[in-house]
């Protein structure tokens, strides 16, 4: 079977500052030099793109300047960080990996990471 398997954690809790990090690991059936990693958010049956980055194997992962994602890559493992999350962003985040070049193309879709985001309680007014 020449399918590409993608593994990611089932659950991640975002920090109080709205930052969530998780690892997306893929078992590559081919010798790709160019890889695209996309984070998708699934809500009900709607799937929307959160961020995407293309990288050359051995080089760093670069997201667009205005992206809410950052990441680093090491071999077939990508460390993803999503910032600026709020409670309403709680949901299933899917890691999609595509081997772009050279052909053949391969698609790998993870089962998703449920990210829980809890908005911090506002600080009570201090009399001091």
């Amino acid at each position: 079977c020449k399918a590409m398997h993608v593994a990611q954690p089932a659950v991640v809790l975002a920090s109080s500052r709205g930052i969530a990090s998780f690892v997306c690991e893929y078992a590559s059936p081919g010798k790709a030099t160019e890889v695209r990693v996309t984070v998708l958010r699934q809500a009900d049956s709607q799937v929307t793109e959160v961020c995407a980055a293309t990288y050359m194997m051995g080089n760093e992962l670069t997201f667009l300047d205005d992206s809410i994602c950052t990441g680093t890559s090491s071999g077939n493992q990508v460390n993803l960080t999503i910032q600026g999350l709020r409670a309403m962003d709680t949901g299933l985040y899917i890691c999609k990996v595509e081997l772009m070049y050279p052909p053949p193309y391969y698609l790998g879709i993870g089962n998703g990471t449920q990210i829980y985001v809890i908005d911090p309680e506002p600080c009570p007014d201090s009399d001091f």
Epitope: C1, K2, P29, T38, M100, P103, P104, L107
Partner: antibody, heavy 118, light 108 residues
Framework: QVQLVESGRGIVQPGRSLRLSCAAS????????MHWVRQSPGKGLDWVAF????????YYADSVKGRFTISRDNSKNTLYLQMNSLRAEDTAVYYC???????????WGQGTLVTVSS | EIVLTQSPGTLSLSPGERATLSCRAS???????LAWYQQKPGQAPRLLIY???SRATGIPDRFSGSGSGTDFTLTISRLEPADFAVYHC?????????FGQGTKVEIK
Amino acid sequence: QVQLVESGRGIVQPGRSLRLSCAASGFTFSSYGMHWVRQSPGKGLDWVAFIWDDGKNKYYADSVKGRFTISRDNSKNTLYLQMNSLRAEDTAVYYCARKGQLGPFDSWGQGTLVTVSS
Amino acid sequence: EIVLTQSPGTLSLSPGERATLSCRASQSVSSSYLAWYQQKPGQAPRLLIYGASSRATGIPDRFSGSGSGTDFTLTISRLEPADFAVYHCQQFGSSPWTFGQGTKVEIK
């Protein structure tokens, strides 16, 4: 709503060329990979070519490699298929299709008929 | 190249009956990358099922997909007049993207 409209249909002689276009609307064209798929009369579907959202990487079916070229103009929201050295077996309805976020072809054009005959 | 073989070629049934369509792959396909399309005469294909069992937007729940490995099934629980069409399976996990030859569901 997502709309894909192909144009360029025609009857051409073997060995000649033809260019198909696919005008996209209702979505951010530059964010999606696009495919060409064809269907010979009374037959099944055959994938022809794929181009990434940025137009940089392209893939072709063996049957058209070296003869067909897929391209796109994101400023015009248009996908193209340049078909050279046409053969009788290239006679088919040609569809453009969008690659959905999870991989399947989630939107299709209405198709355009190409007939290669002397 | 992954070859997909659909059976039967034609299925003759009456409205209200259950339709079971088969798609067999020449090598194992992850269920995440298997789709079904419906095509009516003179029309473009329409995505029905992706990921082997997830219904596309707007697809009624009488359509369901199942299977894994090399054997996949599309089931239409109770055929309605609008369901008589050709159904194609497809794998989209690797290039070349491939389709089955189609199963025609016709009125008996």
